[in-house]
Interface confidence: low
Amino acid sequence: GQFRVIGPRHPIRALVGDEVELPCRISPGKNATGMEVGWYRPPFSRVVHLYRNGKDQDGDQAPEYRGRTELLKDAIGEGKVTLRIRNVRFSDEGGFTCFFRDHSYQEEAAMELKVEDPFYWVSPG
């Protein structure tokens, strides 16, 4: 059946060196265990993380994300996943696209990551 892919509506913010989580889900919710799920970075479709055939695939992963990503699949049975990126870099700032592919049917959602310098970050108050 068809579905929509939903990501965060507002930019997600992270500090350099921290880890960040990018959530993504399908609606209506359904079991996505057997689907292909991934994140890539436009405009050159650099693969950030790919989950296929029930396991993470590092073979197409862009080298700058090697060892830095983890797909949190606790709720994949409900069609919800989260991409965790560790050791955030300034070069991670910008657009990410999350996609779900069920056989030949694919939908995706765009999201944005803002990366800030911790030395210029001041907590309010």
Partner: antibody, heavy 116, light 107 residues
């Protein structure tokens, strides 16, 4: 130990065709994107084509687009490059390489000579 | 296409020398820069990926730096087995492109 072994090179006339093969071993072939890179005699390296793990995404250099086709057979751990309408400027050593953005292992290469 | 320009095209050095090769991209490529070593009649070998990350098994005398458009490969103490041709490669955009190479020869 990762090994990539190319074959299929040789002498061919302009306008002719060749099919290169690359037999892979020592790693899970189906989990990695693969590429072809070539090197004309005495010249530098030129990326030719890349194919994703399942073969559902392919990309080509403009110089070969429409003439070359990259493919793979994961059941045989083999990468292919079908080269049609060959030109003199396609003369080169063709290397298969593991990876899509960064080529961490290379085969020894196979020489393709296009000449009449 | 992004053009990659290496300098020098060739250099002569002695064992123990510190050698620096530079690579310039025609537009910013962030840190998407790899370095390869190639010996005559052999396939290239990956040394450095993502500008500064040492490939597994590569001696620590090799190092890479830079981001944006300017990059450097440094060999801290040249060894006899390091005499070869070195290529940079950008992997920021398709098509991936290589520099013309830098040949390191024995003085």
């Amino acid at each position: 130990e990762v090994q990539l072994l190319e074959s299929g090179g040789g002498l061919v006339q302009p306008g002719g065709s060749l099919r290169l093969s690359c037999a892979a071993s020592g790693f899970t072939f189906s989990s990695y994107a693969m590429s072809w890179v070539r090197q004309a005699p005495g010249k530098g390296l030129e990326w030719v084509s890349t194919i994703s793990t399942y073969g559902d995404y392919t990309t080509y250099a403009d110089s070969v687009k429409g003439r070359f086709t990259i493919s793979r057979d994961n059941s045989k751990n083999t990468l292919y490059l079908q080269m049609n309408s060959l030109r003199a400027e396609d003369t080169a050593v063709y290397y298969c390489a593991k990876g899509s953005y960064t080529f961490d292992y290379w085969g020894q290469g196979t020489l393709v000579t296009v000449s009449s | 296409d992004i053009q990659m320009t290496q300098s020098p095209s060739s250099l002569s050095a002695s064992v123990g020398d510190r050698v620096t090769i530079t690579c310039r991209a025609s537009q910013s490529i962030s840190s998407y820069l790899n370095w390869y070593q190639q010996k005559p009649g052999k396939a290239p070998k990956l040394l450095i990926y993502s500008a500064s990350y040492l490939q597994s098994g590569v001696p620590s005398r090799f190092s890479g730096s830079g981001s944006g458009t300017d990059f450097t490969l440094t060999i801290s103490s040249l060894q006899p087995e390091d005499f070869a041709t070195y290529y940079c490669q950008q992997s920021n955009a398709t098509p991936s492109t290589f520099g013309q190479g830098t040949k390191v020869e024995i003085k």
